[in-house]
């Protein structure tokens, strides 16, 4: 039975040209995390494998930095980066847990972090 929950940074906003940290945290399970995938729509941004470390997809190599922790830092943000991001935790023996973050990239300097929320 899958008992874990994923806590994410929720709905967040950031300024064009700036950077943002996408963070997810898996709790309430003793399952072993084998890999975490970060995705935007149907594009893989990065993989963090428990044994091998980080792989950043070629399309994002210039603008994505691994960490902190299992999180991901997006740099040189553009308005086109607005959208849904997903952290997919591959665990054993539970299976897959998915968290969702919505990022809005703003032209002005009114960007501020939204509230944290949980996905069961």
């Amino acid at each position: 039975m899958m008992t874990g929950t994923i806590e994410t940074t929720g709905n967040i906003s950031a300024e064009k040209g700036g950077s943002i940290i996408l963070q997810c945290h898996l709790s309430s399970t003793t399952a072993q995390v084998t890999q975490v995938n970060w995705e935007q729509q149907d594009q893989l941004l990065a993989i963090c494998n428990a044994d091998l470390g980080w792989h950043i997809s070629p399309s994002f190599k210039d603008r994505v930095a691994p960490g902190p922790g299992l999180g991901l830092t997006l740099q040189s943000l553009t308005v086109n980066d607005t959208g849904e991001y997903f952290c997919i935790y591959h665990t054993y023996p539970d299976g897959t847990y998915t968290g969702r973050i919505f990022l809005e990239v703003l032209e002005s300097s009114v960007a501020e972090h939204g509230a944290r929320f949980q996905i069961p």
Epitope: T34, Q35, N37, E39, D42, Q43, L44, I47, N49, A50, D51, L52, G53, W54, H55, S57, P58, S59, H90, T96
Partner: antibody
Framework: DVQLQESGPGLVKPSQSLSLTCTVT?????????WNWIRQFPGNRLEWMGY???????RYNPSLKSRISITRDTSKNQFFLQLSFVTTEDTATYYC????????????WGQGTSVIVSS | DIVMTQSHKFMFTSVGDRVSITCKAS??????VAWYQQKPGQSPKLLIH???YRYTGVPDRFIGRGSGTDFTFTISSVQAEDLAVYYC?????????FGGGTKLEIK
Amino acid sequence: DVQLQESGPGLVKPSQSLSLTCTVTGYSITSDYAWNWIRQFPGNRLEWMGYISYSGAPRYNPSLKSRISITRDTSKNQFFLQLSFVTTEDTATYYCASLGTDYYAMDYWGQGTSVIVSS
Amino acid sequence: DIVMTQSHKFMFTSVGDRVSITCKASQHVSNAVAWYQQKPGQSPKLLIHSASYRYTGVPDRFIGRGSGTDFTFTISSVQAEDLAVYYCQQYYSLPWTFGGGTKLEIK
């Protein structure tokens, strides 16, 4: 250039253990990469068996978990496959291959070694 | 485990033709797909990673496309030396799995 070379017995009896060695030249197995074993059955189907990481952490295909062990000898720059309780279903060509985190795909392969399980 | 299905075991083509090989994943794999070429008596060789990126030194007639569950590998103009078996592989989640292979043959 990275080169991998498999070696080991070509014939193994049912219920015995299969032991293979992969010797790596041109790169240290402790520097980076996942060092994999992959087998190809008669009829061409490929199966990823498992890897040992550059740090020495093994990871196995759950379908083989109770029978497989991947270890290494860093002084000889070699890694090993042991598969226990073999049956005729384990007859295959066995490849070692490296996977780098730049590409996350098997970029260097050995030439393969054929193993027949038969009494 | 994620099953990668290559629906055609064989594909018949002529030198100079454009040919496309398909691969379908049993569940979402984003663009975490590689393609390999295996010539008779040789080990597989990496051609494409990240669904659409050519590996170092791979000719530009080899093209990969797709995302999610549906992937296509195309040779824009088949050469005699391209006759081989082609495999897709997913690395979205462990265990990494391969398609059954598609053998390219001359008509």
